[in-house]
Amino acid sequence: QGQDRHMIRMRQLIDIVDQLKNYVNDLVPEFLPAPEDVETNCEWSAFSCFQKAQLKSANTGNNERIINVSIKKLKRKPPSTNAGRRQKHRLTCPSCDSYEKKPPKEFLERFKSLLQKMIHQHLSSRTHGSEDS
């Protein structure tokens, strides 16, 4: 059941990214580190880079509430079991600052792409009986 909930959370993050993509014009047009083509075993490290990025509402009024709520939900911390898996490869993964910086639209697209990759890997690892997902 925990595995199922984990998948639901990951898919939910994709939906949150999709919702934020509707409001790119209401986001601060700041360039943010946006991992792409993330090497194997560095997915969780890249994920944390996306979570740490200072994505912000431009406070233009109309959509400010849903944007702020969505951004905060994107930063929901995964459980320590995944943190432990990240830890194993942390020293060999690129730092957040080393990734190319992109405006919010591309940042969100790359975040979605990473989430899709992580979901695919998670499903593959379950199919092949691997624990390290």
Epitope: R5, Q12, D15, I16, Q19, N22, I66, K72, K77
Partner: antibody
Framework: QVQLVESGGGVVQPGRSLRLSCAAS????????MHWVRQAPGKGLEWVAF????????YYADSVKGRFTISRDNSKNTLYLQMNSLRAEDTAVYYC???????????????????WGQGTTVTVSS | EIVLTQSPGTLSLSPGERATLSCRAS???????LAWYQQKPGQAPRLLIY???SRASGIPDRFSGSGSGTDFTLTISRLEPEDFAVYYC???????FGQGTKVEIK
């Protein structure tokens, strides 16, 4: 069982204050965001305010901003709504509702208000 | 801010008939962010559907939700006497409600 019980409603004059309470039981209160929603007589539902599970963020409808304050005491499993400068148009049944998206990664994941109280009536009249 | 417009305002049907309720958003809504509620007279609302199409706990399978983008639908396949009520759609995150659709007995 999971339950929310509102109290504190009543008849109050315009310009006066009132504090509503919502007692939660049957679930880990500190893991859920909480809402206040109201319904004027014969009207539809109007969202009023939301507070994050840990109280770190609060959001308000424009109609109550600057007059109403949402707060919570996780040690008492209680949600509050402090209503100041009350107006006739604040007359309504006030419901507290649990946000269905738990702060726990493996917890509930509903993007909706999944548990509601029975409501408490606030009448603002001179 | 997003506006949710529900139609029709009132739906007059007989038990056993199919009810189709519409909710139109003024801007695109991610399907995860769309919920439906049922409210009977003198009662608190009840969550029926979350994520546009997922039934909440304990909701019978005659209730179904669908749609994406700006157009969403709640369908009650065969109306039971207890289904006559007011139905509201809501966008999560802004927590805006539609004005409601009343399903009444014809």
């Amino acid at each position: 069982q999971v339950q929310l019980v509102e109290s504190g409603g009543g008849v109050v004059q315009p310009g006066r204050s009132l504090r509503l309470s919502c007692a939660a039981s049957g679930f880990t209160f500190s893991s859920y965001g909480m809402h206040w929603v109201r319904q004027a007589p014969g009207k539809g539902l109007e969202w009023v305010a939301f507070i994050w599970y840990d109280g770190s963020d609060k959001y308000y409808a424009d109609s109550v901003k600057g007059r109403f304050t949402i707060s919570r005491d996780n040690s008492k499993n209680t949600l509050y709504l402090q209503m100041n400068s009350l107006r006739a148009e604040d007359t309504a049944v006030y419901y507290c509702a649990r946000d269905g998206d738990s702060s726990d990664w493996y917890g509930d994941y509903y993007f909706g208000m999944d548990v509601w109280g029975q409501g408490t009536t606030v009448t603002v009249s001179s | 801010e997003i506006v949710l417009t529900q139609s029709p305002g009132t739906l007059s049907l007989s038990p056993g008939e199919r009810a189709t309720l519409s909710c139109r958003a003024s801007q695109s809504v991610s399907s995860s962010y769309l919920a439906w509620y049922q409210q009977k007279p003198g009662q608190a609302p009840r969550l029926l559907i979350y994520g546009a199409s997922s039934r909440a706990s304990g909701i019978p399978d005659r209730f179904s939700g669908s749609g994406s983008g700006t157009d969403f639908t709640l369908t009650i396949s065969r109306l039971e006497p207890e289904d006559f009520a007011v139905y509201y759609c809501q966008q999560y995150g802004s927590w805006t409600f539609g004005q409601g659709t009343k399903v009444e007995i014809k």
